[in-house]
Interface confidence: low
């Protein structure tokens, strides 16, 4: 077994039923909707090495995408604020000290946003942080992607796929040093083409919890340890994006 356990280092996840999180889903057992006992990169005997999955998108691209994430910065470079509409919020962001006030929410201005959209998370993510994304799935949608990014790494890739070999599936993964790791797949699929949705991501000490339309969907164990450096959320895919924001709960 690997000799690092974030769960051991950061045990306990606070209030199991926090305000703002779906009430009936706040106290799931470890691995609910996800992968009980999921381990960390490199811990899977006989696992194909990251990047070795047949049909995988080229390095630097998101799985299932035709190419690289549009507008993605070169490694090690954080982009300056975009000049177009629907870009970074002009005010209301907490400072990049890593401390979030207990009030909020902070995030995108109201109204339609241009996709792909980058939501800055200036202090990184911290336990009890709740990210909420509202939008509508486009008709005949193929994919949605949320990418919690740490520089050029993708700490958490949440990727609903509407037609993968005629099946609907949600794929979660992590990309480190341009290599994708072991996919975690979820067959429960709460998205519908042409319909509105609400995605909520709750950061816990040892995992991300994801709820869609107020129902708990899955959780994903942290593979990237430095949560405070996960400083951007990329939102892409076949959606009309209404809002993206975060608050502490």
């Amino acid at each position: 077994a690997d000799n690092f356990s974030l769960h051991d280092a950061l045990s306990g996840s606070g209030n199991p039923n926090p305000q703002g999180w779906p009430g009936a889903w706040g106290n799931q057992p470890a691995g609910a909707g996800g992968y009980p006992g999921a381990s960390y990169p490199g811990a899977y005997p006989g696992q194909a090495p990251p990047g070795a999955y047949p049909g995988q998108a080229p390095p630097g691209a998101y799985p299932g995408a035709p190419g690289a994430y549009p507008g993605a910065p070169a490694p090690g470079v954080y982009p300056g604020p975009p000049s177009g509409p629907g870009a970074y919020p002009s005010s209301g962001q907490p400072s990049a000290t890593g401390a979030y006030p207990a009030t909020g929410p902070y995030g995108a201005p109201a109204g339609p946003l241009i996709v792909p959209y980058n939501l800055p998370l200036p202090g990184g993510v911290v336990p009890r942080m709740l990210i909420t994304i509202l939008g509508t799935v486009k008709p005949n949608a193929n994919r949605i992607a949320l990418d919690f990014q740490r520089g050029n790494d993708v700490a958490f890739h949440f990727n609903p796929r509407f037609n993968e070999n005629n099946r609907r599936v949600i794929v979660c993964n992590t990309k480190l040093d341009n290599n994708w790791g072991r996919e975690e797949r979820q067959s429960v699929f709460p998205f519908e083409s042409g319909k509105p949705f609400k995605i909520q991501v709750l950061v816990e000490p040892d995992h991300f919890k994801v709820a869609v339309n107020d129902a708990h969907l899955l959780q994903y164990n942290h593979r990237v340890k430095k949560l405070n450096e996960i400083s951007k959320l990329g939102i892409s895919g076949d959606i009309d994006l209404t809002s993206a924001s975060y608050t502490m709960i």
Epitope: F4, P41, G51, A52, P58, P59, G151, D177, N179, K226
Partner: antibody
Framework: EVQLVESGGSLVKPGGSLRLSCAAS????????MNWVRQAPGKGLEWISN????????YYADFVKGRFTISRDNAKNSLYLQMNSLRAEDTAVYYC??????????WGRGTLVTVSS | QSVLTQPASVSGSPGQSITISCAGT?????????VAWYQQHPGKAPKLMIY???YRPSGVSNRFSGSKSGNTASLTISGLQAEDEADYYC??????????FGGGTKLEIK
């Protein structure tokens, strides 16, 4: 079997040029970042350069910038290092290495480059 | 001169544990990315032993463990065996693909 095999090392005069090649097999070459690392006789390891799978992102150590050029041909499963303006201090075994989660997990056996008049 | 500082040599007896340190700065070891450790026997290519600070590739003995605190990374080898005698190098990312190595540590088994 995952394998990297370097070639092209030889004796060259100061100021001369050399092109190293690395043949990759046993894995999907285009999916991986690749590196060149060198080791002078009796000395430690020195990272030289890195190239991503699509040749979009390329990085060099300061001591080779402007003199060495890394490239790859995914169709041929090959990595290259073009070395110009060679100096005596470039004498070393040059390794072709695959990136893996911030480490480097597959190494070739190396090819010796000797720069001497 | 190496950017990362390692002791030139360490020694231990079979069955003992030893720790090799790798001191850097907030721009490398203590910064954004991660540390890897390599073992190199004379005349051989290096072998990856630890990556992403503390993970072992498959096939590497669990006697090898990695950790990081602040600007210093450490490799610990427990239950020393004769075949552990080798040179050990730490490496850190300084950006997203750029890397630096330590000067290496020679491990002697008494």
């Amino acid at each position: 079997e995952v394998q990297l095999v370097e070639s092209g090392g030889s004796l060259v005069k100061p100021g001369g040029s050399l092109r190293l090649s690395c043949a990759a097999s046993g894995f999907t070459f285009s999916n991986y970042n690749m590196n060149w690392v060198r080791q002078a006789p009796g000395k430690g390891l020195e990272w030289i350069s890195n190239i991503d799978g699509s040749s979009r992102y390329i990085y060099y150590a300061d001591f080779v910038k402007g003199r060495f050029t890394i490239s790859r041909d995914n169709a041929k499963n090959s990595l290259y290092l073009q070395m110009n303006s060679l100096r005596a201090e470039d004498t070393a075994v040059y390794y072709c290495v695959r990136s893996y989660y911030g480490g480097m997990d597959v190494w070739g056996r190396g090819t010796l480059v000797t720069v001497s008049s | 001169q190496s950017v990362l500082t390692q002791p030139a040599s360490v020694s231990g007896s079979p069955g003992q544990s030893i720790t090799i340190s790798c001191a850097g700065t907030s721009s490398d070891v203590g910064g954004y990315y991660n540390v890897a450790w390599y073992q190199q026997h004379p005349g051989k290519a290096p072998k990856l032993m630890i990556y992403y600070d503390s993970y072992r590739p498959s096939g590497v003995s669990n006697r090898f463990s990695g950790s990081k605190s602040g600007n210093t990374a450490s490799l610990t080898i427990s239950g020393l065996q004769a075949e552990d005698e080798a040179d050990y190098y730490c490496s850190s990312s300084t950006g997203y693909s750029t890397r630096v190595f330590g000067g290496g540590t020679k491990l002697e088994i008494k």
